[in-house]
């Protein structure tokens, strides 16, 4: 005789799994008992149930209430059992051992696979493996997040480009008369590489971080306070250069945007005299910025 089973039994999450084990015997042979066990690699066999021709079904405590025989009429040679309400943890190898008289013992193994279905109304052809479903879901979420990021970056860059253009136009108008004078003063009073003419600065208005010529210019990109000087008593050219360095594409952080906004607001409260900025005279000499902080 021989045992008939399936190599793989596939069941949908939450459904009952039929674990088939049918003894195809020779004339006069009888099935005495069928023992079912879980036999996952690396672990000892865990008994599920014992099906006795005379005493019926005995289910092990670990599977109490979850293992049943098919209802009658039953073929006496059918050692199949039902595993109720299959969960992911049930996935694995199972073995059925059939004791027959007089032929002796037979055993066969099968693998139980538990599937998750995206839509319970869909037929089994549309069922997908839980792992595959997880991968797909993660992939979709990642793709959506990436698209969102791209949209945010594009919108931000457009916004900053517009802002920078407005600032540049405004400054260009105000500073045209003093530009040459400012540059001369810068050369005579500063050695900071950030105050060099445009041609010698590693990162231009339209440049990207990749175009930095040496690491010394990276301080422009850093978030460390010493990376920039935003003193209100700095030169016009220095402000102008910093504006160019922090133009769209340079990857500014939120903190930097706030400082940028601060510059714009501050400019309204200073006048240019001989290439330097001096505070405009006001009623009380105190300037309160948009956030209500004293400057």
């Amino acid at each position: 005789g021989e045992l008939e089973t399936s190599d793989v039994v596939t069941v949908v999450l939450g459904q009952d799994a039929k674990l088939p084990c049918f003894y195809r015997g020779d004339s006069g042979e009888q099935v005495g008992q069928v023992a079912w066990a879980r036999v996952d690699a690396g672990e000892g066999a865990q008994e599920l149930a014992l099906l006795h021709s005379k005493y019926g079904l005995h289910v092990s405590p670990a599977y109490e209430g979850r293992v049943e025989q098919p209802p009658p009429p039953r073929n006496p040679l059918d050692g199949s059992v039902l595993l109720r309400n299959a969960v992911q943890a049930d996935e694995g190898e199972y073995e059925c051992r059939v004791s027959t008289f007089p032929a002796g013992s037979f055993q066969a193994r099968l693998r139980l696979r538990v599937l998750v279905v995206l839509d319970p109304q869909e037929d089994s052809g549309k069922q997908v493996d839980l792992v595959s479903a997880s991968v797909v879901v993660v992939g979709v979420i990642a793709a959506l997040l990436f698209c969102l990021l791209v949209v945010v970056v594009v919108l931000m860059s457009r916004y900053h480009r517009r802002k920078a253009q407005q600032m540049t136009q405004k400054y260009e108008e105000e500073l045209t008369l003093t530009r040459e004078n400012s540059i001369r003063r810068l050369h005579s009073h500063h050695t900071d590489p950030r105050s060099q003419p445009e041609e010698s600065v590693g990162l231009r208005a339209e440049g990207h971080p990749d175009s930095l010529k040496d690491n010394s210019s990276c301080s422009v990109m850093s978030e460390e306070p010493e990376g920039r000087s935003y003193s209100t008593l700095t030169t016009v050219r220095e402000i102008e250069t910093q504006t160019e360095l922090l133009s769209p594409g340079s990857g500014r952080a939120e903190e930097e945007e706030d400082q940028d906004e601060g510059i714009k607001q501050a400019m309204n409260h200073f006048v240019q005299e001989n290439g330097t900025l001096r505070a405009k005279p006001t009623g009380n000499g105190i300037y309160i910025n948009g956030r209500g902080h004293l400057v």
Epitope: E4, K18, S27, N75
Partner: antibody, heavy 118, light 107 residues
Amino acid sequence: QVQLKQSGPNLVQPSQSLSITCTVSGFSLTTYGAHWVRQSPGKGLEWLGVIWRGGSTDYNAAFMSRLSITKDNSKSQVFFKMNSLQADDTAIYYCAKIGYDGYAMDNWGQGTSVTVSS
Amino acid sequence: DFQVTQSPASLSASVGETVTITCRTSENIHNYLAWYQQKQGKSPQLLVYNAKTLADGVPSRFSGSGSGTQYSLKINSLQPEDFGTYYCQHFWSSPWTFGGGTKLEIK
């Protein structure tokens, strides 16, 4: 080659019994059991009962009180007997071998057409 | 009472077409289901058992699928010899009822 040959009357008087013999070849009745099924004129199939290879039987509850299925392994014969036939028992009666799965019917007899009439 | 509902009751199709016949049961039958084909004046023939397993000698254009309470028989690229009546039968709890049948006719 598996074969199932049926023999029995084609006409039965109302309230009388119907007996059909199914003689099998190509397999042993100690290895495979047999089903009995009927088909009323212009209608579908109706399962009546089964005899397992060990000799135990299961019947459709609707026919249990008047149905008997037995067999003789040595003669390779299965016997079907239904009592108290009425006009609505007029049908083609089939015997069929249990298949490899232990339940489905993988080989069928030629059928016995039975008319219940006086 | 246990119900087996087969649909459609009749179906017209042309040679080469693909058709699907469905069988619904009133409770989970755990793949204990078979499909049969019967031609006029002949005995039924087993096509599929255990819901998905093709019986010996059955062409591969036939396929069974489903689980739980819903099962189907699909016939790809219909051939002239495929026309006839198809039945499903469950082997769950007694009685082992057949579906009402689906008559497949040539269009």
